[in-house]
C-alpha cells in the first residue's frame, strides 16, 4: 500500500510512462540493434529495465540520459514485444511495448530478357525474380545505369515484368534490375545482361 | 528428445559445499532459461534462483550469497553450487526449464536429486 | 519478501466435482499476468498446467481452467478425475525488487 502511495503522491506528468525506442525498426536475423529507454524527467535518477515478454534482459541506472540497452537480433523470437520500466524509489511506469520486424533479404535477383525483333523496332520484356527474401520485394530495372521503370512492388514470389520498345539500335545496351524489400539501405542487383547493338544476326534474345 | 538430467546430490555435513549439475538435451542453454527449484522432505516448492538465455541471473532472497548459478554452455550444463549447507536445505533440487522468453513458465522438468545435509 | 498464499490447503472431493484453487500474491505479479499453475504427484517432478494466469499449457486436458489478474488467482478444475487427485501450486514471477519468482503454500487434492 505505501509504495502505491508513493507513487500516486507523483504527479503524472511529473513521472509518465517512458519512451522506448530503436533507430532501426526492421532488421534481418544477425543484426546488432541498440534500444533506448528514455525519459522526460532529466532530473531524477532513474533505474531502467529492459523486458523482452517475460524475460528480464537487463537494467541500467540514468540521470537525463537515456538507458541503451545493446542487443543482437538472432532468433524469430526475439522480435519483442519490448518494454522498458522507469523506477525512482517506489514508483515505477512501464513504456509501450515495441517490436522489430524481422526481414530476410534480398538474394541477387535473375534478369531474363525476351525480345520481339521487328524491322524498326524491339520490343523488350524484362522479368526480375530474386527467389528468396521476404516479400513485398520492390524491383527497379535499369538501362545503361539509369532507371527506366519505377518500383514495382510484387507480394508475391513471381517476377516482375517491364516492357519497353525502341527503335532498332545502333549500340549495346545494358540492362540490370535491382530487388529490395523493407531492409533499410540492402538492395541486390542482378547481373548485367548486354543487348547487342543491331546488325545482321545479332540478337540473341529475340524470337524468330 | 527434450530433456533435463540433475546430478551431483548425496550426503553433505552441516556448513560444507556441494555443485548440483543440470544438463540439458535436445535443446540450447543459449535460447532458454533454466531456474532451480528445490522442495524439503513433505514440503512445498520452493524457487532458489534462475539463469537466463543471456546468462544473467536471478536469485530468492535466501538463497543469495550462499548460493550461485552458473552454466557451461559449452557442456550445455547448468550448475548450483550451494556453500555453508545447514539441515534445512536438506531436499530434493529440481532443474527446470521456461518457455522462451518466459523464465518462470516451466514446462520442462529434470527428474530431481536429492540433497541430503547430516552429520 | 513477496508472500503466494494458496487456499484451501487442503480439499477432499469426489471425482466429478468441481474444484477451484485461489492463489493471492501480497504483490501484483508482472504484466498482471505473470503466473502459473503446477501439479505435482508424490514422487514426480511438477507438470505444468496453466501459463499467463488463463493459457492452458500443451496436453492439459480443457477441464482445467485459470483465470485472475493482479494480486488474485484461480484455478478450476471444472470435473475432478481419478488423475487429478494431486497437489497443486502457483507460480508468480515479479519485477517489484529485482526480478523474482515465488511458488505458492500449495493445496492438496484428496479423495473424500
Known amino acids: 500500500r505505501k509504495a502505491v502511495l508513493d507513487c500516486e503522491a507523483m504527479k503524472t506528468n511529473e513521472f509518465p510512462s517512458p519512451c522506448l525506442d530503436s533507430k532501426t525498426k526492421v532488421v534481418m536475423k544477425g543484426q546488432n540493434v541498440s534500444m533506448f529507454c528514455s525519459h522526460k524527467n532529466k532530473s531524477l535518477q532513474i533505474t531502467y529495465s529492459l523486458f523482452r515478454r517475460k524475460t528480464h534482459l537487463g537494467t541500467q541506472d540514468g540521470k537525463g540520459e537515456p538507458a541503451i540497452f545493446n542487443l543482437s537480433i538472432t532468433e524469430a523470437h526475439e522480435s519483442g514485444p519490448y518494454k522498458c520500466k522507469a523506477q525512482v524509489t517506489s514508483c515505477s511506469k512501464y513504456s509501450r511495448d515495441f517490436s522489430f520486424t524481422i526481414v530476410d533479404p534480398v538474394t541477387s535477383p535473375v534478369l531474363n530478357i525476351m525480345v520481339i525483333q521487328t524491322e524498326t523496332d524491339r520490343h523488350i520484356t524484362l522479368h526480375c525474380l530474386s527467389v528468396n527474401g521476404s516479400l513485398p520485394i520492390n524491383y527497379t530495372f535499369f538501362e545503361n545505369h539509369v532507371a527506366i521503370s519505377p518500383a514495382i512492388s510484387k507480394y508475391d514470389r513471381e517476377p516482375a515484368e517491364f516492357n519497353l520498345t525502341k527503335k532498332n539500335p545502333g549500340e549495346e545496351e545494358e540492362y540490370r534490375c535491382e530487388a529490395k524489400n523493407r531492409l533499410p539501405n540492402y538492395a541486390t542487383y542482378s547481373h548485367p545482361v548486354t543487348m547487342p547493338s543491331t546488325g545482321g544476326d545479332s540478337c540473341p534474345f529475340c524470337l524468330k | 528428445e527434450v530433456q533435463l538430467v540433475e546430478s551431483g546430490g548425496g550426503l553433505v555435513q552441516p556448513g560444507g559445499s556441494l555443485r548440483l549439475s543440470c544438463a540439458a538435451s535436445?535443446?540450447?542453454?543459449?535460447?532458454?532459461?533454466i531456474t532451480w527449484v528445490r522442495q524439503a522432505p513433505g514440503k512445498g516448492l520452493e524457487w532458489i534462483g534462475t539463469?537466463?538465455?543471456?546468462?544473467?541471473?536471478y536469485y530468492s532472497t535466501w538463497a543469495k550469497g550462499r548460493f550461485t548459478i552458473s552454466r557451461d554452455n559449452s557442456k550445455n550444463t547448468v550448475y548450483l553450487q550451494m556453500n555453508s549447507l545447514r539441515a534445512e536445505d536438506t531436499a530434493v533440487y529440481y532443474c527446470?526449464?521456461?518457455?522462451?522468453?518466459?523464465?518462470?513458465?516451466?514446462?520442462?522438468w529434470g527428474q530431481g536429486t536429492l540433497v541430503t545435509v547430516s552429520s | 519478501d513477496i508472500q503466494m498464499t494458496q487456499s484451501p490447503s487442503s480439499l477432499s472431493a469426489s471425482v466429478g466435482d468441481r474444484v477451484t484453487i485461489t492463489c493471492q500474491s501480497s504483490?501484483?505479479?508482472?504484466?498482471?499476468?505473470?503466473l502459473s499453475w503446477y501439479q505435482q504427484k508424490p514422487g514426480k517432478a511438477p507438470k505444468l498446467l496453466i501459463y499467463?494466469?488463463?493459457r492452458l499449457a500443451s496436453g492439459v486436458p480443457s477441464r482445467f481452467s485459470g483465470s485472475g489478474s493482479g494480486t488474485d488467482f484461480t484455478l478450476t478444475i471444472s470435473s475432478l478425475q481419478p488423475e487429478d487427485f494431486a497437489t497443486y501450486y502457483c507460480?508468480?514471477?515479479?519485477?517489484?525488487?529485482?526480478?523474482?519468482?515465488?511458488f505458492g503454500t500449495g493445496t492438496k487434492v484428496t479423495v473424500l
Open positions: 535436445g535443446f540450447s542453454l543459449t535460447i532458454y532459461t
Open positions: 507460480l508468480g514471477g515479479y519485477d517489484s525488487s529485482g526480478w523474482y519468482a515465488a
Open positions: 527446470a526449464r521456461g518457455y522462451v522468453d518466459s523464465d518462470w513458465y516451466l514446462n520442462i
Open positions: 539463469i537466463n538465455s543471456y546468462g544473467n541471473t
Open positions: 499467463d494466469a488463463s
Open positions: 504483490e501484483s505479479v508482472y504484466d498482471n499476468n505473470y
